[in-house]
């Protein structure tokens, strides 16, 4: 007795397609071993037609596939364009040879059933309408015209020319003639349902001289389109319902036994399970729209249906489109935190995954807004300037090649709480959703800048200090100058005539940035932050205003010549710690590659460092350095 299970008998008709599901026991070996579909010959040999190793026989070319669903312990063989030659005995099985575990399946493909010779076949989709053409002889022009539906015993009236209408066709059936043509009448039936399928007879006149025509109306449910998506990825349902429903409300629902639960519609309804990760986008005036769901979960798998109706809810007899969504748990998309927590005044660093094969793609970050149909306006991108209201507090750091980019948002307020999406202009499956929660701060921030009201004087030296706690002792500290194109990390060394530097005071764990001399271009936002390798941590921001020295004032330069010499000396110490190897430029520099990671003087273990020059618009540059402070007890 084989542990493989499937349909023992499958029957279909020529031209149709079948989906044969085979079930296998839940073991790791079974999930990963070869799956096959073979045809049994008279000799008892079973000839492979298709296998999960990629083999496809000539007779199945272009019309069959085999898909494994390891999470369901099933695999499915889909065969299209069936002919009577496909009738026969088959096996679905597992194993490296066709003598492994298997199950016998008998497939019978029969001819399309014969209808009376004069039968006209109309094939329509559910929810659509049909116009049945009924020809008659001129002598029956004055006679009654009718359409009836055949039942087992009789023919039940649908509509006739005396305006009699069957109750189940009221408002849906119309009998009419076109122009002056007195040899044909028409019956239009709208909002077709499965119950409308069957044989009809249209008739003009009575008795033996009556004109009759047989009609076979086939009402088809749309075949669900199969969608295979990875866990945590995104899916787009493209719904094309036709111009006749262009002005109706649209919806997407998920089948739940006998009902279809609306997930989203254009009237503002949205299932809370999809909060922050769904958008509905009307495409055009032809009834087309799309629904995008990001951050796919295992429980999102299922049977989906889109449709249109003024109520925004599923209604029988209205056009629909369907999908079967499978969510593969063996995902290529890394498992990241879906909720990030911050505090007011603080900062968050959000790591956004992208397809590592598309390192040159443009990266974006948008904020999901649920009003209306939902939308996600871009706040920042690799080539998109930061939105004005986020000035000085939002930046995107692209780390080419490692499959992650980082978005940092600081000066948080409770208004920042909500859902954000990471997306690129490349592989759309890699759209991910982050929920940002912002709580009221209950303690001082980890990073603090002094002075807090920073006004630098043109031509002088200006120093700001960033205080950090001992827990950031082993992390790299950096200063960067924010612009709406990003936050350019200041290089740790510059021997240009204009000197600026960052130094670290041993006793009080601080990293300082000195602008020397201050120029007008120095005005703007600066961030102090910590990072470990490519992982960014907390940041804090300060705005430095630059003003001219008021004439005649006896302004005292904050750093005298001795202090300036001291800074230079400290820089020399920093420089002496950079080995030849560490001075190599970053390969394949991206927009933020002009970053010199901060040197930690006093560290016993030298970490691998990279450097590069960050030129500002006028060719001047800023520099930053940092030291670890060892406390001896």
């Amino acid at each position: 007795k084989s542990p493989i299970f499937g349909p023992q008998e499958v029957s279909s008709i020529e031209g149709d397609s079948v989906s044969i599901t085979c079930y296998y026991p839940d073991t790791s070996v079974n999930r990963h071993t070869r799956k096959y579909w073979c045809r049994q010959g008279a000799s008892g040999m079973c000839t492979t037609l298709i296998s999960s190793n990629g083999y496809l026989s000539k007779e199945y070319s272009g019309r069959a596939n085999l898909i494994n669903f390891p999470e369901n312990n099933t695999f499915v063989i889909n065969i299209e364009q069936l002919t009577q030659d496909d009738t026969g005995s088959y096996k679905c099985g597992l194993g490296t040879s066709n003598r492994g575990l298997s199950f016998d399946v008998s497939l019978e493909v029969s001819q399309v059933p014969e209808l009376p010779s004069d039968t006209h076949v109309y094939t329509k989709d559910i929810g659509r309408n049909v116009t049945i053409e009924c020809p008659f002889k001129r002598e029956n022009a004055p006679s009654k015209k009718s359409l009836c539906k055949k039942t087992n015993q009789s023919c039940e009236l649908v509509i006739d020319s005396t305006e009699k209408v069957n109750p189940s066709y009221i408002g849906r059936a119309k009998l009419f003639m076109k122009g002056t043509d007195l040899t044909v009448f028409y019956v239009n039936i709208s909002h077709l349902t499965h119950n409308d399928a069957g044989l009809y007879i249209c008739q003009a006149g009575e008795g033996p001289s009556a004109d009759k025509k047989n009609v076979d109306l086939q009402v088809l449910a749309p075949e669900p389109e199969l969608l295979y998506k990875d866990l945590r990825s995104s899916v787009t349902f493209e719904c094309d319902l036709g111009r006749e429903v262009a002005n109706e409300a649209k919806y997407l629902c998920r089948m739940n036994k006998e009902t279809c639960d609306v997930i989203i519609n254009t009237l503002g309804k949205r299932d809370p399970d999809f909060e922050g990760r769904i958008l509905i986008t009307p495409k055009d005036d032809n009834g087309r729209f799309s629904v995008l769901i990001t951050g796919l979960r295992k429980e999102d798998a299922g049977h989906y249906q889109c449709g249109a109706h003024s109520s925004g809810l599923p209604q029988e007899g209205w056009p629909i489109q369907t999908w079967q969504l499978f969510v593969n748990e063996e995902s290529t998309i890394p498992n990241r935190r879906s909720v990030v927590k911050g505090v007011t005044g603080g900062s968050v660093a959000i790591a956004c995954p992208y397809n590592p094969k598309e390192s040159s793609s443009l990266k974006y970050w948008c904020r999901w807004e649920g009003d209306g149909n939902g939308h996600c306006p871009v706040l920042v991108g690799t080539q998109a300037q930061v939105q004005e209201e986020y000035e000085g507090r939002l930046a995107l750091f692209d780390q080419p090649g490692n499959g992650t980019y980082t978005v940092i948002l600081n000066q948080l307020t409770t208004e920042d709480a909500g859902f954000y999406w990471c997306l690129t202009n490349g592989d759309s499956r890699w759209r991910t959703t982050i929920e940002l929660q912002v709580a009221e701060a209950t303690r001082e921030p980890n990073l603090e800048v002094t002075p807090q009201n920073a006004t630098a004087v043109l031509g002088e030296t200006f120093t700001v200090s960033c205080h950090y706690p001992c827990k950031f002792y082993s992390q790299e500290k950096y200063w960067c100058k924010w612009s709406n194109k990003g936050c350019h990390i200041l290089p740790s060394h510059d021997e240009g005539a204009r000197q600026s530097s960052v130094s670290c005071d041993q006793s009080s764990q601080l990293v300082s940035m000195t602008l020397n001399p201050v120029s007008k271009e120095d005005e703007g936002w600066y961030w102090c932050g910590v990072k470990q390798g490519q992982t960014y941590g907390e940041t804090t921001a300060i705005y430095i205003a630059v003003e001219e020295r008021t004439r005649g004032s006896s302004h005292v330069n904050p750093t005298d010549a001795n202090a300036r010499a001291k800074v230079a000396l400290e820089e020399e110490v920093v420089d002496s710690s950079i080995s030849e190897k560490e001075n190599k430029a970053i390969p394949n520099p991206g927009p933020f590659a002009n970053e010199r990671e901060i040197q930690n003087v006093g560290d016993q273990a030298q970490e691998n460092r990279a450097s590069g020059d960050a030129g500002s618009a006028d060719g001047q540059s800023r520099s930053s350095s940092s030291k670890h402070h060892h406390h001896h007890h």
């Epitope: 023992q8 029957s11 279909s12 599901t21 312990n73 559910i126 299922g302």
Partner: nanobody, 129 residues
Framework: EVQLVESGGGLVQAGGSLRLSCAAS????????MGWFRQAPGKEREFVAA??????????YYAESVKGRFAISRDNAKTTAYLQMGSLNPEDTALYYC????????????????????WGQGTLVTVSS
Amino acid sequence: EVQLVESGGGLVQAGGSLRLSCAASGRTFSSGIMGWFRQAPGKEREFVAAIEWSGGNTYKYYAESVKGRFAISRDNAKTTAYLQMGSLNPEDTALYYCAADESPSRYIDLRRPAPYHYWGQGTLVTVSS
């Protein structure tokens, strides 16, 4: 709401045959599944056979223990399923339940009761030796 009513059960001698019917009312399915399960006294409910249809396709599933002896079918009006049982033996004695659903995800094991939403009350089949 769909109602399922089983009929055709009764007492039969070993080696004999019976034909069970399951009539569905309340709604017709353009695609769907109807199955038969059975439960012998003191035992768990077990799968017997199922028939699934969609468009012009029909898929018939059987439990190993009834293969070659039982045959499942349905009428074209899509409202009644039949289970033709032959070569009956005392181990076939049980309460036979009919179950149905609009096409469930065909990636769920149809031998489990879970995919079936609608159930009948059952009809008793007793096979005497």
